[in-house]
């Protein structure tokens, strides 16, 4: 299973649920569904209040039980480490795959943390992060922001992911904006 890691704003906008949580239990495989289940302890929720309704406490995250079908394998054994988890809701259960955005909270830049906490949501309705995988790239709409991180190397590598959000500048126009300049 291979997939290009999404821009964190894309991950936020395309997910039903975005939370901060600790992986606290050993994984179990359900003998009927053949899905693997990780026990988690949720510490914060950034998206999904409406989708979840009253069941606002997520205790488990589900993933296919095999790598080749995009199952997520949690490598950290540190049960106190917090992770940002962006996933989909299926039948009220949080599902993730290899292609989901799952990252240690401490590995996120301050700008990304600000994005997940409050800023990315502003761009979800109108704006689209458009991946540029090979040159030349052409914007298909004024609401697209060209994401060129995959083309860059060195100190510029990952700059848009780590520091920028695609946000409305005016109706019908979205641009890259620094998350540093957003009010914390």
């Amino acid at each position: 299973c291979t997939c290009v890691p999404p821009h964190p704003q894309t991950a936020f906008c395309n997910s039903d649920l975005v939370i901060r949580a600790k992986f606290v239990g050993t994984p179990e495989v359900n003998q009927t569904t053949l899905y693997q289940r990780y026990e988690i302890k949720m510490t914060k929720m950034y998206k999904g209040f409406q989708a979840l309704g009253d069941a606002a406490d997520i205790r488990f995250v589900y993933t296919p039980a095999m790598e080749s079908v995009c199952g997520y394998f949690h490598r950290s054994h540190n049960r106190s480490e917090e992770f940002l988890i962006a996933g989909k809701l299926q039948d009220g259960l949080l599902h993730i795959t290899t292609c989901s955005f799952v990252a240690p909270w401490n590995s996120l830049s301050l700008a990304q943390r600000r994005g997940f906490t409050k800023t990315y949501t502003v761009g979800c309705e109108e704006c689209t992060v458009f991946p540029c995988l090979s040159i030349p790239c052409k914007l298909q709409s004024g609401t697209h922001c060209l994401w060129t991180d995959q083309l860059l190397q060195g100190s510029e590598k990952g700059f848009q992911s780590r520091h920028l959000a695609c946000l409305p500048r005016e109706p019908g126009l979205c641009t890259w904006q620094s998350l540093r300049s957003q009010i914390a």
Epitope: V29, Q31, T32, T33, L34, A65, M66, E67, G71, F73
Partner: antibody
């Protein structure tokens, strides 16, 4: 009593196709994930494929991926294995088995022999 | 492609105890408590003897026991009897291969 009965095995030429069936009885079929396991003559057991109780999740061994398809019909209490592009190394007794606790196999069929030869 | 390593053969006299090892990796035996053991007599389907490392299904003699240490699981048969002569296979869940079996161990009762 709880029982699994395989059928559909036989002699087939390399590159040919075969569909195995496994009829289940004595338990609520849809509540159990099922699997196919094979055993080449004089050799050990090899896991082939698995399918969840609903049929929504399927898993395959690398050796059969892209050639074999596992499926199930819960209304008929039947498990299937569609085998295409068969090779000599697919020659084996094929068992269907029921997943139980800890992903163990608690119920096995009697097996059906598949021979791939020209 | 055998994922779990078992000795090809072991032997023991009636009344003795024998142990069969099953060595894997941290992604199968070592990573989960999903190790099972099967007994197979010639021409017959395998029979589940141990699941979840050390649990016995009902109807299986308490002479059979299982354990695990690190990446190695073990099946011990105490008070060996003639009818224990068979092939024994270990099996484990593996995140990368889903299900893996050992190559099998032929138990001979002398």
């Amino acid at each position: 009593q709880v029982q699994l009965v395989e059928s559909g095995g036989g002699l087939v030429q390399p590159g040919g196709s075969l569909r195995l069936s496994c009829a289940a009885s004595g338990f609520t079929f849809s509540s159990y994930a099922m699997s196919w396991v094979r055993q080449a003559p004089g050799k050990g057991l090899e896991w082939v494929s698995a399918i969840s109780g609903s049929g929504g999740s399927t898993y395959y061994a690398d050796s059969v991926k892209g050639r074999f398809t596992i499926s199930r019909d819960n209304s008929k209490n039947t498990l299937y294995l569609q085998m295409n592009s068969l090779r000599a190394e697919d020659t084996a007794v094929y068992y269907c088995a029921r997943y139980w606790r800890g992903l163990s196999f608690d119920i096995w069929g009697q097996g059906t022999l598949v021979t791939v030869s020209s | 492609d055998i994922a779990l390593t078992q000795p090809a053969s072991v032997s023991g006299s009636p009344g003795q105890s024998i142990t069969i090892s099953c060595t894997g990796t941290s992604s199968d035996v070592g990573g989960y408590n999903y190790v099972s053991w099967y007994q197979q007599h010639p021409g017959k389907a395998p029979k589940l003897m141990i699941y979840d490392v050390s649990n016995r299904p009902s109807g299986v003699s308490n002479r059979f026991s299982g354990s695990k240490s690190g990446n190695t699981a073990s099946l011990t048969i105490s008070g060996l009897q003639a009818e224990d002569e068979a092939d024994y296979y270990c099996q484990s869940y593996d995140f990368y291969k889903f299900n893996v079996f050992g190559g099998g161990t032929k138990l001979t009762v002398l």
